[in-house]
């Protein structure tokens, strides 16, 4: 049973002779007159056991002293520590001749663990070993004591255990602790990798190359590697690794990122206060959770504040100039936080009895510079239809529109455009045609561009070639005319008029007068 | 074991000589040097002296050269404590005990079982 | 000549109780002091040396400590075998006893 006793972190102890409770009980020999176990007490009065030997009177003196069998768990090199001290010959009387100052320090290689006797030829010496001149004096019980301290190492070992052995040749000597250690590189976590406890070299030069892991919550960068010295001294730290998101390095550790903190990559950062508008409600956060009514664009960085779609542009101004439209607005009060603002544009057309009942514009109006995107507060918008209800709505959009789209962000204008000449009528029709009449119809044109006043119709005969024409004029969408000459072929021309002006002329009508009283009715173009 | 054997109890005129033998055994008698104390009746412990039993060297306490001569015979690992012209006051057991050096210091850590000396006319 | 005065003289103590002894040197003896122990009709045995260091198979209810000129042996509990006459004993260049505590049953 061994008591604790504390020594370097990079020393591994495999005999400790001051931590044996009770009788060392090692081999002397001879068995009787040389080497003796005996207790003394020691700084804290309590009691340790030593070996000790003086026999100083008679020459030749050759007592051996082996320890117990010591297991080398894999060390290659042992470094071995005594603490002694040592009789001055002079202190002792009548023994100058047979006295000496010095005794052998031995070791054999052993897989046996259970030999019981020396056998002095097995033993290699490792040490003649001398008091210094510089000695510690250690108080043991009530009296001043010169304790030595002498270390030797061997190796390297191969065997799975090894004896050691004291042979004195005439000293008055004891030794007061024996230890036996092995040098280890000791556990240590270095740029966030674990470096086992590893064994020194056979070599007092050597070096052992040794791979580090990760520690929990951490990645490799590069691969982390340090070799470990003789002297147990971890040297030339290469590569590391580097906390996991949601983790930053504290005390040599990963530790998750506290509430409220967050870090979103692999790096070797601390973890970061949660961004403006945002939080985190657990430990280890990548990122924070946007605010309520705050968001984050897709490609926002999570060190990005959260952001609000901007509000509605300000003070809307439109400008009518016949079928185009000039807009213009101010920035949005509240921009939500962000630089990415930009405006959409909106086209309604609307009926002039229902302005709820409105449409989109379709894709024959223009927008200079363009309908989204746009960058600046102004948009010129042409081709409208005239005299037309409008509905112009522009939006404020930012990165994070997407996820909240609220009417709020857009503001409105209603314009009615001005009214121009109507387009040309599309079909005209001879509904009846007699030998002194024909009865004409048509449509409204496509594109009234305004409140039509009238129509005119033009005629001629066919010969005639539009050199001698006449006009009928109606509000109606037909009219009969009348005193028409028989079997004859007459040209029809419709054109419709707004208070802007007349509109071009339908495509030629050619109807011919019959030459009987009976009534032809005809609905096509060119009535024969 | 280790023992040292002195022998019985003697009675002398004054004036005469005793010679009291301590035989050693168990251990190598030149290894350790052989020391010698008195002890008058009712009376405590008196060092005499020691002899080196290696190189024959004596060493004697004050108050008993003189009269008193310590001596050897390897040989038989027997020291010896000689005393002349006795006198009543010598009258005292008188011991031989085995002198051990160490580190820590010195004692006599084997004792014979004493010789009564007796001077009487 | 060093001398070794011992106090008390005689002690008396119940067996189980604890014994202290002094011994008290007329000059400094460093640690170079020993205790005997002698029963009547025997010869003195050796208990400690070097001032506190035991001897072989001495029990270690005896201890001592001391240096320089005052010393003390102590029987932690003492046991119906102890009762004897303790000495101590100084080992310069010249070797002198105290001159002796008796240790009786009370």
């Known amino acids: 049973v061994t008591g604790s006793r504390v020594y370097p972190a990079n020393e591994v102890t495999l005999l400790d002779s001051r931590s044996v409770q009770g009788e060392l009980g090692w081999i002397a020999s001879p068995l009787e007159g040389g080497w003796e176990e005996v207790s003394i007490m020691d700084e804290k009065n309590t009691p340790i056991r030593t070996y000790q030997v003086c026999n100083v009177m008679e020459p030749s003196q050759n007592n051996w002293l082996r320890t117990d069998w010591i297991t080398r768990e894999g060390a290659q090199r042992v470094y071995i520590e005594i603490k002694f001290t040592l009789r001055d010959c002079n202190s002792l009387p009548g023994v100058m001749g047979t006295c000496k100052e010095t005794f052998n320090l031995y070791y054999y290689e052993s897989d046996n663990d259970k030999e019981r006797f020396i056998r002095e030829n097995q033993f290699v010496k490792i040490d003649t070993i001398a008091a210094d001149e510089s000695f510690t004096q250690v108080d043991i019980g009530d009296r001043i004591m010169k304790l030595n301290t002498e270390i030797r190492d061997v190796g390297p070992l191969s065997k799975k255990g090894f004896y050691l052995a004291f042979q004195d040749v005439g000293a008055c000597i004891a030794l007061v602790s024996v230890r036996v250690f092995y040098k280890k590189c000791p556990l240590t976590v270095r740029n966030l990798a674990q470096f086992p406890d590893t064994i020194t070299g056979a070599d007092t030069s050597s070096l052992v190359e040794v791979r580090g892991s990760c520690v929990n919550n951490s990645e490799e960068k590069d691969v982390p590697k340090m070799y470990c010295g003789a002297d147990g001294e971890w040297l030339v730290p290469i590569g590391n690794c580097l906390c996991n998101a949601g983790h930053e390095e504290r005390s040599g550790e990963c530790q998750a990122c506290k509430i409220g903190y967050y870090k979103a990559l692999s790096t070797d950062a601390t973890c970061a206060k949660c961004p403006p508008h945002s939080y985190s409600v657990w430990e280890g956060a990548t990122s924070c959770t946007c605010d309520r009514g705050f968001f984050r664009a897709d490609n926002d960085a999570a060190s990005m504040p959260c952001t609000r779609p901007p509000s509605a542009p300000l003070n809307l101004i439109s400008n009518v100039n016949e079928t185009s439209v000039n807009l213009e607005w101010s920035s949005p009060q509240n921009t939500g936080g962000r630089q990415d603002i930009s405006y959409n544009v909106v086209c309604k057309k609307c009926g002039a009895g229902d302005p709820s009942k409105c449409r989109p514009c379709g894709s024959g109006v223009h927008y200079t510079p363009q309908q989204n995107g746009l960058k600046t507060t102004k948009v010129s918008i042409t081709d409208l239809l005239a005299h037309t209800n409008y509905t112009f709505e522009i939006w404020a959009v930012n990165g994070v529109s997407k996820y909240n789209p609220n009417p709020d962000q857009s503001v409105s204008v209603t314009v009615t455009t001005n009214q121009a000449a109507p387009s040309s009528i599309a079909l005209v029709q001879a509904k009846e045609v007699t030998r002194y009449s024909v009865a004409l119809a048509w449509l409204e044109p496509d594109r009234p561009n305004g409140v039509i006043l009238e129509y005119e119709v033009k005629y001629y005969e066919k010969d005639q070639n539009e050199r001698s024409y006449r006009i009928v004029r109606t509000a109606a969408r037909n009219t009969d005319i009348k005193g028409l000459n028989p079997l004859t072929s007459y040209v029809f021309h419709v054109r419709a008029r707004t208070a802007a002006g007349y509109g071009d002329f339908s495509e030629p009508l050619e109807v011919t007068t019959n030459t009987v009283p009976s009534r032809i009715i005809g609905d096509g173009a060119n009535s024969t | 074991q280790v023992q040292l054997l002195q022998s019985g109890a003697e009675v002398k005129k004054p004036g005469a000589s005793v010679k009291v033998p301590c035989k050693a055994s168990?251990?190598?008698?030149?290894?350790?040097?052989m020391s010698w104390v008195r002890q008058a009746p009712g009376q405590g412990l008196e060092w005499m002296g020691w002899?080196?039993?290696?190189?024959?060297?004596?060493t004697y306490a004050q108050g008993f050269t003189g009269r008193f001569v310590f001596s050897l015979d390897t040989s038989v690992s027997t020291a010896y404590l000689q005393i002349s012209s006795l006198k009543a006051e010598d009258t005292a057991v008188y011991y031989c005990?085995?002198?051990?050096?160490?580190?820590?210091?010195?004692?006599?850590?084997?004792w014979g079982q004493g010789t009564l000396v007796t001077v009487s006319s | 000549e060093i001398v070794l005065t011992q106090s008390p003289a005689t002690l008396s103590v119940s067996p189980g109780e604890r014994a202290t002894l002094s011994c008290r040197a007329s000059?400094?003896?460093?640690?170079?002091l020993a205790w005997y122990q002698q029963k009547p009709g025997q010869a003195p045995r050796l208990l400690i040396y070097?001032?506190?260091t035991w001897a072989t198979g001495i029990p270690d209810r005896f201890s001592a400590s001391g240096s320089g000129t005052d010393f003390t042996l102590t029987i932690s509990r003492v046991e119906p075998e102890d009762f004897a006459v303790y000495y101590c004993?100084?080992?310069?260049?010249?070797?002198?006893f105290g001159q002796g505590t008796k240790v009786e049953i009370k």
């Open positions: 005990a085995r002198v051990r050096f160490t580190v820590y210091g010195d004692g006599m850590d084997v």
């Open positions: 168990g251990y190598t008698f030149t290894s350790r040097a």
């Open positions: 002899i080196n039993t290696n190189t024959g060297n004596p």
């Open positions: 000059q400094s003896v460093s640690s170079n």
């Open positions: 070097g001032a506190s």
């Open positions: 004993q100084q080992y310069g260049p010249s070797w002198t």
